[in-house]
Interface confidence: medium
Amino acid sequence: EPKFTKCRSPERETFSCHWTDEVHHGTKNLGPIQLFYTRRNTQEWTQEWKECPDYVSAGENSCYFNSSFTSIWIPYCIKLTSNGGTVDEKCFSVDEIVQPDPPIALNWTLLNVSLTGIHADIQVRWEAPRNADIQKGWMVLEYELQYKEVNETKWKMMDPILTTSVPVYSLKVDKEYEVRVRSKQRNSGNYGEFSEVLYVTLPQMSQFTCEEDFY
């Protein structure tokens, strides 16, 4: 049966919900899938279910709620129906489903190189996603930077920060690194997708190498 896979708000002003539409062998044709939503109010004695306002904008098997249909103040309930019967249902508040778009415009600058030329420190900078209204205070984002050597599989995670730049220390100068950043709403929601990977190549800085490394 169709099931909700994800509801997501990128900026607390709109949201969309997605569902699977797999037809399993041996199951009868369910007919067209419809999404209905309601906001719970006890004074509306019969819950007022309304159909999805926009099945197109968020892609296939989805429903998009623009800013006219989105409010942070009260939870939503949504249900998937087919042939008049409910096949899946869930309730949430908008703040619970916030997943920001990826940070953008990643770049790096060299901070310093060790005396031996073996290690270097860099400063990584990025920008908040365009639709996260940081200036207005409408979203307060927390960022997580991860980095690794290109040939490694495991990412090193840095502690979450509220700023849009962070120093990364003691990288090996003869290696190439991948850096990526993701963000989440502070004290709420889940991390969004990672940014595009930033490649950091630190060319060899000196002709000699040394067993010990002094700064």
Epitope: S71, W73, I74, D95, G137, R186
Partner: antibody, heavy 123, light 108 residues
């Protein structure tokens, strides 16, 4: 008992600054949205700004955006409204009010208000 | 922006009268409307929230209702202490809260 007490109002010249305080008791400001609402003499109510100190969210009316800053100090259980570049049209009684909070069944409203503090902008 | 158009701006009534004040939202606001009472020199007091829910401690002669984008505050039998100014307010919009212009209820 829930109580909100505003202070910091007074007479200020156009272009001047003032900082209003809203001391809360009987609840934690970190658990609620705190709003400022103003009322010009003989006029209606105008929403000014709100803050959620837990999430760090703030929002402002267009008429004060870029000039006013709302903040909160959870250790003092107090919200603030920093008002810069004040204009004659900012003259009003300023109220802080508590937003009743998000519920599964009800839309929120201002359930508690302070007594108000008068801000007069005049040369 | 969502406008809340309140009417009438003032009305004269007698004790015991049934009084109706209306507010029309410029777009759908679900049931996200509250009503407040304000007396001169005092802070507003919450009467009705979520369009029709009576706030704790408010007399039952006050009631609220909704029909689409039209909201109504009714005082079934006006009492001497009810002479005041009444405001509607929408809280549907997540980052912009708006009030109606107010209705002054005066003694006839």
């Amino acid at each position: 008992e829930v109580q909100l007490v505003e202070s910091g109002g007074g007479l200020v010249q156009p272009g001047g600054s003032l900082r209003l305080s809203c001391a809360a008791s009987g609840f934690n400001v970190s658990s609620y949205y705190i709003h400022w609402v103003r009322q010009a003499p003989g006029k209606g109510l105008e929403w000014v700004a709100y803050i959620s100190s837990y999430y760090g969210y703030t929002s402002y009316a267009d008429s004060v955006k870029g000039r006013f800053t709302i903040s909160a100090d959870t250790s003092k259980n107090t919200a603030y409204l920093q008002m810069n570049s004040l204009r004659a049209e900012d003259t009003a009684v300023y109220y802080c009010a508590r937003w009743s909070g998000t519920s599964e069944y009800y839309w929120p409203a201002f359930d508690y208000w302070g007594q108000g503090t008068l801000v007069t902008v005049s040369s | 922006d969502i406008q809340m158009t309140q009417s009438p701006s003032s009305l004269s009534a007698s004790v015991g009268d049934r009084v109706t004040i209306t507010c029309r939202a410029s777009q759908s606001v679900s049931s996200a409307v509250a009503w407040y009472q304000q007396k001169p020199g005092k802070a507003p007091k919450l009467l009705i929230y979520s369009a029709s829910s009576l706030y704790s401690g408010v007399p039952s002669r006050f009631s609220g209702s909704r029909s689409g984008t039209d909201f109504t505050l009714t005082i079934s039998s006006l009492q001497p202490e009810d002479f005041a100014t009444y405001y509607c307010q929408q809280s549907y919009h997540s980052f912009l809260i708006t009030f109606g212009q107010g209705t002054k209820v005066e003694i006839k």
